[in-house]
C-alpha cells in the first residue's frame, strides 16, 4: 500500500469549542437550503477502496477542493459563519500541505473526482450541498488525520 507522510493534524485543531460550533452552524444553515437529501458527497462511497492510512490524504484533497471551488466562490453567503470558518479550514489545509502519498494514488483521485463531478453536475446546489456537509468534512478530517 502507498505510504503517506506528514498526514497528521494535532487533536487540538478539533477541540476548539468556538470554531467547532461555528463550523457546525454553517453546515446546518447551508443544509437548510439543500433540498437534494438523497445525494451524499462525504460518506461510504468516498472512502470505498481507500485504506485507513490513506484517508487523511484523501480528505486533504477534498478539503482543498471545497476551499478553492466551493467556499471561496460562495464566501459572501452564510455570514457571519463563513468569514470565520473559511480561515480555520484554510489553516488545516496549510498544515496538510506536506501530506503526500508515495506510490500510486489513482484510486484516491478517482473517488475524489467522483465527488467533484457530483458537485459540478449539481451546479450551485452542489456547492450548497458541499457547505452543508462541512460537519462531515470536519469529522472526516478529525477521524482520518489525528
Amino acid at each position: 500500500a502507498p505510504i503517506s507522510s506528514h498526514c497528521r493534524l494535532d487533536k487540538s485543531n478539533f477541540q476548539q469549542p468556538y470554531i467547532t460550533n461555528r463550523t457546525f452552524m454553517l453546515a446546518k444553515e447551508a443544509s437548510l437550503a439543500d433540498n437534494n437529501t438523497d445525494v451524499r458527497l462525504i460518506g461510504e462511497k468516498l472512502f470505498h477502496g481507500v485504506s485507513m492510512s490513506e484517508r487523511c490524504y484523501l480528505m486533504k484533497q477534498v478539503l482543498n477542493f471545497t476551499l478553492e471551488e466551493v467556499l471561496f466562490p460562495q464566501s459572501d453567503r452564510f455570514q457571519p459563519y463563513m468569514q470565520e470558518v473559511v480561515p480555520f479550514l484554510a489553516r488545516l489545509s496549510n498544515r496538510l500541505s506536506t501530506c503526500h502519498i508515495e506510490g500510486d494514488d489513482l484510486h484516491i483521485q478517482r473517488n475524489v473526482q467522483k465527488l467533484k463531478d457530483t458537485v459540478k453536475k449539481l451546479g450551485e446546489s452542489g456547492e450548497i450541498k458541499a457547505i452543508g456537509e462541512l460537519d462531515l468534512l470536519f469529522m472526516s478530517l478529525r477521524n482520518a488525520c489525528i
Epitope: 443544509s31 451524499r40 462525504i42 460518506g43 461510504e44 470505498h48 462531515l136 469529522m139
Partner: antibody, heavy 119, light 107 residues
C-alpha cells in the same frame, strides 16, 4: 413511496438460527445502508449493527459480534439479518431501518418482525 | 462505547403543556444526535436529526437543541397524539447507541 417491508413472525427453539429479511422499495437501494435494531418485550431499542448496500461492509455492536451476520442482495433490494445460537432473551421485535452510515439517522423503518425463542 | 442517558424515564403531563426531555452522552458527540417517537406496537419514527433539524413530516411543535454532551427534546404544546415513548440516539460513523427511553404519559 419509500418503504421497508420485513418478513413474517418466527418461532424458534433455543440454539437455532433465524434469518429476517427486509425488502426496500421507492429509493436507490445502494445509496443507503441498513441498520438492525431490536426491542425485547416491554424494553427499549437496542442497535445491533449496520450493513452497507453499496459494498456489503458491516459493523456490528460488540454484544452481537460472532453471532450475527448482516448481508444485502442488490438484485432484489433486500437486506438480511441472521442471528445464531438463539436464547430466550433474544425474543424481541427486530426492525430494519434505512441508514447511510457516516452519521446518518434512521429515517425509514420496517414494520418489525417478532422472533420468539421458546423450547 | 458511548453511553446515552435519558431523563426522566417516565414523565406525566397534560394537553397543552410544554415538555422537555433530556439526553446526555458519555462523551462529546458534536451534533450527531437523533430523536425518535414510538407508540405501542409500532415502529419508531424519526423526529429530529443532527440535534436540532426537524425530520420530514414531523410536527413543528417538536424541537431539539444541544451540542457536545447535553441535548434536549422539547414539545411546545402537548397534543393527544404525542403520548408515546421517546428515544435519543447517538449517530456514529458506522454505529449507533440508543438511550433508555422516556415514556410520556397523560397526567
Amino acid at each position: 413511496q419509500v418503504q421497508l417491508v420485513e418478513s413474517g413472525a418466527e418461532v424458534k427453539k433455543p440454539g437455532a438460527s433465524v434469518k429476517v429479511s427486509c425488502k426496500a422499495s421507492g429509493y436507490t437501494f445502494t445509496s443507503y445502508g441498513i441498520s438492525w435494531v431490536r426491542q425485547a418485550p416491554g424494553q427499549g431499542l437496542e442497535w445491533m449493527g449496520w450493513v452497507s448496500a453499496y459494498t456489503g461492509n458491516t459493523n456490528y455492536a460488540q454484544k452481537f459480534q460472532g453471532r450475527v451476520t448482516m448481508t444485502t442482495d442488490t438484485s432484489t433490494s433486500t437486506a438480511y439479518m441472521e442471528l445464531r445460537g438463539l436464547r430466550s432473551d433474544d425474543t424481541a421485535v427486530y426492525y430494519c431501518a434505512r441508514d447511510r452510515g457516516y452519521y446518518d439517522a434512521f429515517d425509514i423503518w420496517g414494520q418489525g418482525t417478532l422472533v420468539t425463542v421458546s423450547s | 462505547d458511548i453511553q446515552m442517558t435519558q431523563s426522566p424515564s417516565t414523565l406525566s403531563a397534560s394537553i397543552g403543556d410544554r415538555v422537555t426531555i433530556t439526553c446526555r452522552a458519555s462523551e462529546g458527540i458534536y451534533h450527531w444526535l437523533a430523536w425518535y417517537q414510538q407508540k405501542p406496537g409500532k415502529a419508531p419514527k424519526l423526529l429530529i436529526y443532527k440535534a436540532s433539524s426537524l425530520a420530514s413530516g414531523a410536527p413543528s411543535r417538536f424541537s431539539g437543541s444541544g451540542f457536545g454532551t447535553d441535548f434536549t427534546l422539547t414539545i411546545s404544546s402537548l397534543q393527544p397524539d404525542d403520548f408515546a415513548t421517546y428515544y435519543c440516539q447517538q449517530m456514529g460513523e458506522y454505529n449507533a447507541t440508543i438511550g433508555g427511553g422516556t415514556k410520556l404519559e397523560i397526567k
